[in-house]
């Protein structure tokens, strides 16, 4: 006799208004008496509709939450599993049931903001900027909302950057416990003459940090050939262990680059008689603290003002 199990009931994808953080939920299947004591597990697969691959999780729960790109639709499917020890060693699963979440097509794509860029300056404040949609009426203005886990609900930007009295960006500070988790943004718009398409963005703050440049550069030469360069990590909340550095060294007309995770570097002069010895440095959050980052601006150039060659007095 073939053992069968029913799929979960009432599978749906719900939007609680958190700008892309959706709830996938379902109810237990109708289970025949024989399996009442068995633990049910659910295999859930989901993706944005343009994605090639499904994300798969197994859960004993009746809800799963994750972040999605709401610029695109979402689809999911789920089935019930009975573990083998409940079914005389055979693997038993129900048919799949499916659910989808369609995006709002209100407003043409040309009304959506363009070139959304966000930078988390020195791990202290976030600045996002955008350009208006390609074809919008002059009365169009945009509003930015954001949410991350820890906030009760989505919040609106309180400090807009403006151009010609229109919102073209937003500055956010005091983002407590907001890194190492998905940060969701929605920029929607309003016009009396046409609906405006919303734009959604999701990223993690630690991956878009632009630090301040290193400071207090110092260069010294020992034994007339050993160069030592030092600098200080910029002030702010970024731990010193989180920096990586790129250094440009210039000796007379020759310059070359080097890299280090320390805030000093030693090397040998290329020519004993060189008269010009300078360096400058920039920094970025390293791979131990983030998956990505933005280079700081270059520091001021620091030059050695000492003994320049064996014949100098």
């Amino acid at each position: 006799l073939e053992i069968k199990v029913n799929p979960p009931q009432d599978f749906e994808i719900l939007d609680p208004g958190l700008l892309g953080y959706l709830y996938l939920q379902w109810k237990p299947p109708v289970v025949i008496e024989k399996f009442k004591g068995c633990t049910l597990e659910y295999e859930l697969k989901y993706r944005n509709v343009d994605s090639d691959s499904w994300k798969t999780i197994i859960t004993r729960n009746l809800i799963y939450k994750d972040g999605f790109d709401l610029n695109k639709g979402i689809e999911g499917k789920i089935r019930t599993h009975l573990s083998e020890h409940c079914t005389n060693g055979s693997e038993v699963q129900s048919p799949w049931i499916e659910a989808s979440y369609g995006i709002s097509d209100e407003g043409s794509l040309e009304t959506k903001i363009q070139d959304m860029k966000c930078i988390y300056y020195n791990w202290q404040y976030l600045v996002c900027s955008w350009k208006p949609g390609k074809t919008v009426y002059s009365d169009t203005n945009y509003t930015m909302f954001f949410w991350y886990e820890g906030l009760d609900h989505a919040l609106q930007c309180a400090d807009y950057l403006q151009h010609d009295e229109k919102n073209v960006g937003c500055k956010l500070s005091n983002l407590d416990s907001s890194d190492y988790k998905d940060f969701f943004i929605c920029v929607n718009g309003s016009s009396k003459l046409e609906p405006i398409r919303s734009s959604y963005t999701v990223f993690q703050l630690q991956n878009i940090v632009k630090p301040l440049p290193p400071e207090f550069l110092h260069i010294s030469v020992e034994n007339s050939i050993d160069i030592r360069m030092k600098w200080s990590t910029p002030g702010g909340p970024i731990p010193p262990r989180c920096y990586t550095y790129e250094i440009v060294i210039r000796e007379d007309d020759i310059s070359w680059e080097s890299a280090t995770d320390k805030n000093d570097m030693k090397l040998k002069r290329r020519a004993n008689e060189s008269e010009d010895l300078c360096f400058f440095v920039r920094c970025k959050v390293n791979i131990y603290c983030a998956d990505d980052g933005i280079w700081s601006e270059w520091s001021e150039e620091e030059c050695w003002e000492g003994y320049t060659g064996p014949d100098s007095k």
């Epitope: 999780i57 859960t59 004993r60 729960n61 799963y64 573990s83 083998e84």
Partner: antibody
Framework: EVQLLESGGGLVQPGGSLRLSCAAS????????MSWVRQAPGKGLEWVSA????????YYADSVKGRFTISRDNSKNTLYLQMNSLRAEDTAVYYC??????WGAGAFDYWGQGTLVTVSS | DIQMTQSPSTLSASVGDRVTITCRAS??????LAWYQQKPGKAPKLLIY???SLESGVPSRFSGSGSGTEFTLTISSLQPDDFATYYC??????????FGQGTKVEIK
């Protein structure tokens, strides 16, 4: 008596490969999901991979996805972990573990003695 | 991913003491939680599964409680054999299966 016996560990260079085996006895092997769990020297437990009783479904930690492959041969009562592109951070004692009940993973009621994998040049 | 946080990291106690270790999940995991004991150089040993069910052969001085996000492992009267490291583990949702960072119970 349930027994799980790992083998195949050893010293390997970064980028190299190893295949771990876990010989099971004392229970109906094909009726239970199995997992690999590792423990780096002086560190806590880290789940690596799981496989359903039939071998039809496999799951991986993000840290090993695309590099490690879990498989099983129910006719030989043996669980495997093929490890490719090994990195220094894969250095650990690797345990195979039997799931007490559950289709893919659960509480682990029996563990092997562990096999040490060292990735170093 | 569901994060599991154990406290304390280290616990100093004497034989006969009542010892409690806490495990907190970053989201509800119902009762899908296990507790393990591990001694140096040895494999972990299952003590408690489904938050409160005692594994066969485990002394009754060990007990587990809790559901949702807060769980505790209690040793009613600590014995010399109980000095070890204890781990909690969730199996509500995976991948990944996640463990707590461990609590070392040492002699005071």
């Amino acid at each position: 008596e349930v027994q799980l016996l790992e083998s195949g560990g050893g010293l390997v260079q970064p980028g190299g490969s190893l295949r771990l085996s876990c010989a099971a006895s004392g229970f109906t092997f094909s009726s239970y999901a199995m997992s690999w769990v590792r423990q780096a020297p002086g560190k806590g437990l880290e789940w690596v991979s799981a496989i359903s009783g039939s071998g039809g479904s496999t799951y991986y930690a993000d840290s090993v996805k695309g590099r490690f492959t879990i498989s099983r041969d129910n006719s030989k009562n043996t669980l495997y972990l093929q490890m490719n592109s090994l990195r220094a951070e894969d250095t650990a004692v690797y345990y195979c573990a039997k799931v007490r009940y559950g289709w893919g993973a659960g509480a682990f009621d029996y563990w092997g003695q562990g096999t040490l994998v060292t990735v170093s040049s | 991913d569901i994060q599991m946080t154990q406290s304390p990291s280290t616990l100093s106690a004497s034989v006969g003491d009542r010892v409690t270790i806490t495990c907190r999940a970053s989201q509800s995991i119902s009762s899908w939680l296990a507790w393990y004991q591990q001694k140096p150089g040895k494999a972990p040993k299952l003590l408690i599964y489904d938050a409160s069910s005692l594994e066969s052969g485990v002394p009754s001085r060990f007990s587990g409680s809790g559901s949702g996000t807060e769980f505790t492992l209690t040793i009613s009267s600590l014995q010399p054999d109980d000095f070890a490291t204890y781990y909690c583990q969730q199996y509500d949702t995976y991948p990944p299966i996640t463990f707590g960072q461990g609590t070392k119970v040492e002699i005071k």
